[in-house]
Interface confidence: low
């Protein structure tokens, strides 16, 4: 298992606004 | 439910700073940008910018570069808009708004009066 | 920035009659296939509240007496029959480009 602080892979979440303002879609950030 | 509550009502002199919080409740925090909103008295609507609270970067709108910012406190589902340099024209209601889908802003803060004088 | 006009400024209407609110946007606010604009109603001491979103979508909760429609720079809020409780002032709202809101419309009762 990953450890909490590892930043290697990304996280992925459906979100609104994150990627792009007003839109919703999977984000993701390192 | 879903619920962003804002402090209480402000009142400061010209120059000085003010830092006001809005609390969230009832969802994910980091799943939707929140929105800052500008009415002086009698006034309009005026959009000030917005947080990405996945990211926590900010956007602010033309008229409001400089002397305001934007922040997060993610742990506590706590957004805050803090006001530099205070003007007698910063004295007006300020809002908190949930983005939503489509960029519309579904649920709202109470509100938070500052009353810049001297 | 978008800038949103709407139109009249204030309009006195009597009960059960029709409300029509215009609000026309320097440029399109239609993207992806939808059209990026809202409306709120605001009572005095309260935050707005949404009454329509994407240009004609109800939101839950809102009296069907409330109805939008529009596409582009155009847009309309009509409010049908008009009851006293609807005394308030009407915004609309563009998330196309940013934000901007429209400079309202105070709905009195004639």
């Known amino acids: 298992r990953r450890r909490r602080r590892d930043t290697h892979f990304p996280i992925c979440i459906f979100c609104c606004g994150c990627c792009h303002r007003s839109k919703c879609g999977m984000c993701c950030k390192t | 439910q879903i619920q962003l509550v804002q402090s209480g009502p402000e009142l400061k002199k010209p120059g000085e700073t003010v830092k006001i919080s809005c609390k969230a409740s009832g969802y994910t925090f980091t799943t939707y940008g929140m929105s800052w909103v500008k009415q002086a008295p009698g006034k309009g609507l005026k959009w000030m910018g917005w947080?990405?609270?996945?990211?926590?970067?900010?956007t602010y709108a033309d008229d409001f570069k400089g002397r305001f910012a934007f922040s997060l406190e993610t742990s506590a589902s706590t957004a805050y808009l803090q006001i530099n340099n205070l003007k007698n024209e910063d004295t007006a209601t300020y809002f908190c708004?949930?983005?939503?889908?489509?960029?519309?802003?579904?649920?709202w803060g109470q509100g938070t009066l500052v009353t810049v004088s001297a | 920035d978008i800038v949103l006009t709407q139109s009249p400024a204030s309009l006195a209407v009597s009960l059960g009659q029709r409300a029509t609110i215009s609000c026309r946007a320097s440029e399109s606010v239609d993207s992806y296939g939808n059209s990026f604009m809202h409306w709120y109603q605001q009572k005095p001491g309260q935050p707005p509240k949404l009454l329509i979103y994407?240009?004609?979508n109800l939101e839950s909760g809102i009296p069907a007496r409330f109805s939008g429609s529009g596409s582009r720079t155009d847009f309309t809020l009509t409010i049908n029959p008009v009851e006293a409780d609807d005394v308030a002032t009407y915004y609309c709202h563009q998330s196309n480009e940013e934000y901007t809101f429209g400079g309202g419309t105070k709905l009195e009762i004639k």
């Open positions: 994407r240009a004609s």
């Open positions: 708004g949930r983005d939503h889908y489509y960029g519309e802003v579904a649920y």
């Open positions: 947080i990405n609270t996945y990211s926590g970067v900010p």
